[in-house]
Interface confidence: low
């Protein structure tokens, strides 16, 4: 709800390059970058290679033209370069930039992959689409490190083992592990390649049952998180073709044996839903353990609306399905094609997530924002970002999403979304969130036996009503304007009945008070009112509810940023509820005990008159 769709930072890539198929927010020292995968681009650094794809870096600040430049991966201009004893590379159509991931630390490196990279050493027998990944240094400058996790010397069979593994179709980076999905291994049973950077060894998946489930595409999506314990890292892999319905596995990375051991699995619910084709590990409820979101973008009630299943971690890797999210359930939306953790977008202490539906609105695309809370995830999305509304040129907006990094320096993480069919990427900046604390002070009860006020004609029962407001938040302005409406006896009004009390202000009677306040940061401002009780009130049992509804007035001032225009704050979302505060009081019952039971006796007599 606090992302600003009105001032998108738009980066445009080369035409028909699929620029935006993958996106990644990155920082090095004080520089913020949007990294973009364009897997069908030509590379200026390898002009003789046919459309190998490229990774572009787009500087966020001091880049008025929103220019993006290709990253030089120092891979040379030549074709057919030797890459091992029995390895010669063919980079034509390799799809560099199909996936991007960042190591989660200050000088974090970047993983960029090309899953269609081929080893053509055994050209006469088989062209082997092993897939290729590259670890790029944090400064995006120096030469990085090449990974071909499926290459093994003298192995030349296509389907067997890792011949056609296509590693890197998905990638994930932890502080120590590089996780690469390889869905083509073992006749497309698929596997996950996990490189431990500390000892430079690969963890192996030796689970025979999984390895023999051909054509399941394990590794089509990968992630990692703290599932079994807050201090251990476990690896997650999606197998979207498993039994036609899809499956997700969590593996413990066992350092001693150097293997991945299955600790959890869950299956999809509908044939062809592609359950497991997108994954997101995020601690939604702040308990130190990762929860899991699993996308099934082709889940259909009518056609491919898509669905995301949320699993909450109950400890020791035992995950419990909380609910399924569907966004707006739009026709052919592919909701769940991408899922990204956004860190704490609105500064409420819980992480938030974005879910892409890139085919919604006839391929324009949309992104939905959901919020974590103590119970897991808030089922109602707080915001829908429509590609069409952000910029009508956008196509497949939401195919890729990256978040969690404050790109504009206002203290809130921002969100970057790719729209590869229009070769576009959009950075959406987060607005500061204002929390308004509202108190309504009322008497414990209203004395209706001894009127304390006068309405100009006769004594009336009355009560004092005081409202107090203050506000706080991270990186919010020092002063704000607040519009508020104080309503009396709202429960009656909501039922279409006449309120029993009314305000008296400067001799005028009114059912509600509307005011505009100028508030200063962390300073309480109060207003005092007198409310009169109507004469001959019949209902003296039900409580009288007062409600203060409030909104920011137009003249809110945001802090100025140097390069990017300032964004004004928003009020904290109330999980879909009205932004208002209520309090209630009751009519004094004048009973000896609180439990006021009626002692009534009725006698009836039937009187009939003959006509």
């Amino acid at each position: 709800y606090n992302l600003d769709p009105q001032r998108p930072v738009h980066f445009q890539g080369p035409a028909d390059s699929f620029f935006g198929y993958a996106v990644l927010e990155h920082f090095h020292d004080n520089t913020r970058w949007v990294l973009v995968g364009a897997p069908k681009a030509d590379s200026k650094y390898s002009p003789s290679v046919k459309s190998p794809g490229a990774v572009f870096k787009c500087r966020v600040h001091t880049n008025p033209d929103r220019r993006c430049t290709e990253l030089d991966m120092a891979r040379g201009k030549n074709r057919g370069t030797s890459c091992g004893k029995t390895c010669r590379e063919d980079r034509d159509d390799e799809w560099m930039g199909v996936s991007l991931a960042r190591q989660p630390k200050a000088d974090g490196r970047v993983l960029a992959c090309a899953h269609r990279w081929k080893n053509i050493y055994y050209e006469a027998d088989h062209i082997l689409p092993h897939g290729f990944c590259y670890i790029i240094p944090s400064n995006l400058q120096a030469k990085g490190r090449t990974l071909i996790p499926c290459y093994e010397e003298y192995k030349k069979k296509y389907g067997e083992e890792h011949g056609s593994c296509q590693a890197g179709i998905a990638g994930f980076f932890t502080e120590e592990l590089v996780v690469m999905g390889a869905p083509g291994s073992f006749y497309w049973a698929g596997t996950i390649k996990v490189l431990n950077l500390t000892d430079n060894t690969y963890l192996k998946l030796n689970d025979e049952v999984i390895m023999n489930r051909r054509y399941t595409y394990l590794g089509y999506a990968v992630t990692a998180g703290h599932f079994s314990h807050p201090s251990t890292i476990d690896v997650v892999g999606g197998a979207p073709q498993d039994k036609g319905i899809g499956k997700v596995y969590i593996f413990r990375a066992d350092r001693r044996s150097g293997t991945l051991i299955k600790i959890f699995q869950a299956s999809g619910k509908k044939m062809g839903s592609y359950f497991g084709s997108s994954l997101c590990a995020v601690d939604l409820n702040g308990d130190g353990l990762s929860d899991l979101l699993v996308g099934a973008p082709m889940f259909s009630e009518i056609r491919d609306e898509g669905q995301v299943t949320v699993y909450i971690n109950r400890g020791n890797g035992a995950l419990e399905e909380q609910l399924a999210l569907t966004g707006d359930g739009a026709y052919n939306a592919h909701f769940g094609e991408s899922i990204a953790s956004l860190d704490d977008l609105d500064n409420d202490g819980f992480p938030d997530v974005a879910i892409g539906a890139p085919k919604e609105d006839d391929f324009a695309g949309a992104v939905y924002i959901y919020h974590g809370d103590a119970g897991g995830i808030v089922p109602q999305y707080s915001m829908k970002l429509s590609g069409q509304k952000i910029n009508p040129v956008l196509r497949m907006f939401g195919q890729s999403i990256s978040g969690g990094i404050d790109m504009d320096g206002n203290g809130y993480p921002d969100v970057t979304v790719g729209a590869f069919m229009s070769d576009s990427v959009v950075l959406l900046r987060a607005r500061p969130v204002i929390t308004v604390d509202v108190s309504i002070f009322l008497p414990g009860s209203i004395n209706i036996t001894a009127p304390q006020c006068h309405d100009g004609q006769q004594p009336v029962n009355c009560l004092n009503v005081t409202t107090c407001f203050s506000f706080h938040g991270k990186h919010v302005p020092g002063e704000i304007g607040l519009n508020y409406v104080l309503m009396a006896d709202v429960a009656k009004k909501e039922k279409g009945q006449m309120p029993r009390v009314y305000f008296v202000l400067l001799g005028e009677t009114m059912g509600q008070v509307t005011e505009k306040l100028q508030l200063t940061y962390m300073e309480e401002t109060c207003r005092h009112y007198v409310a009169h009780v109507k004469r001959r009130v019949q209902d003296v049992i039900s409580p009288i509810v007062f409600e203060a509804a409030y909104s920011l007035s137009e003249h809110v001032t945001g802090e100025e940023e140097r390069e990017l225009p300032p964004l004004t704050p928003v009020l904290r979302w109330k999980k879909g509820q009205k932004i208002a505060q209520k309090n209630q009081t009751v009519f004094e019952r004048n009973c000896r005990s609180e439990d006021c039971a009626a002692d009534l006796q009725l006698q009836g007599k039937l009187l009939l008159s003959s006509m």
Epitope: D4, Q6, R7, P8, H10, P64, D65, R66, R431, G478, E479, G481, Q518, E554, H555, V556, T557, G558, E560, E563, L564, P565, P566, L567, T568
Partner: antibody
Framework: QVQLQQSGPELVKPGASVKISCKAS????????MNWVKKRPGQGLEWIGW????????KYNEKFKGKATLTADTSSSTAYMQVSSLTSEDSAVYFC???????????????WGQGTSLTVSS | DIQMTQSPASLAASVGETVTLTCRAS??????LAWYQQKQGKSPQLLIY???SLEDGVPSRFSGSGSGTQYSMKINSMQPEDTATYFC?????????FGGGTKLEIK
């Protein structure tokens, strides 16, 4: 209604300084930005800078840093601009204009003063 | 600084004629554009903000459009009281910069 009343015309000698005032009424002075704009005969408009009276924060166009100083007196709801080391290049009409930062409106100047004519001549 | 280039510099139009003024920014200003009208001897008046939003009280014959770096303002049926100089201004980044102005007169 909102009004911005500027001080009268000034004839000043080169090298001197001048202080132009802009008295605001009809709105909350501390809640809006007060901008100053320069208009030379036959030329376009130039934004000099703004002051936010509520906090005293200022933002200047680099071109006018050291030339113009913006201040505000909240008790009298008056904004001031002092222009120093005057030369003939400073001869112009100077406007004050109200604006605010808003999600809907950005930095747009919705009310303007009537302008103060400054002539620098020996 | 963002440069704003306005055209034409001057224009004469008949009453009832449709007039279009254009403004080009040196970089994308993402709809953060205003149009102001300044009549002889008066202070400027805000007509259009956010590229296409009409300020309260401005006649509906004025309209704004555009995106990216190219923006325009249209006066649907020129009236004698529309004789003035019109300025565009970018509100995207500091320093806020104005176009050179278009002087519009009655033919």
């Amino acid at each position: 209604q909102v009004q911005l009343q500027q001080s009268g015309p000034e004839l000043v000698k080169p090298g001197a300084s001048v202080k132009i005032s802009c008295k605001a009424s009809g709105y909350s002075f501390t809640s809006y930005y007060m901008n100053w704009v320069k208009k030379r005969p036959g030329q376009g408009l130039e934004w000099i800078g703004w002051i936010f009276p509520g906090s005293g924060n200022t933002k200047y166009n680099e071109k006018f840093k050291g030339k113009a100083t913006l201040t505000a007196d909240t008790s009298s709801s008056t904004a001031y601009m002092q222009v120093s080391s005057l030369t003939s290049e400073d001869s112009a009409v100077y406007f004050c204009a109200r604006s605010w930062v808003s999600y809907e409106r950005g930095y747009y100047f919705d009310y303007w003063g009537q302008g103060t004519s400054l002539t620098v001549s020996s | 600084d963002i440069q704003m280039t306005q055209s034409p510099a001057s224009l004469a139009a008949s009453v009832g004629e449709t007039v279009t003024l254009t403004c080009r920014a040196s970089e994308n200003i993402y709809y953060s554009l205003a149009w102001y009208q300044q009549k002889q001897g008066k202070s400027p008046q805000l007509l259009i903000y956010n590229a296409n939003s009409l300020e309260d009280g401005v006649p509906s014959r004025f309209s704004g459009s555009g995106s990216g770096t190219q923006y325009s303002m249209k006066i649907n049926s020129m009236q004698p009281e529309d004789t003035a100089t019109y300025f565009c201004k970018q509100a995207y980044d500091v320093p806020y910069t104005f176009g050179g102005g278009t002087k519009l007169e009655i033919k």
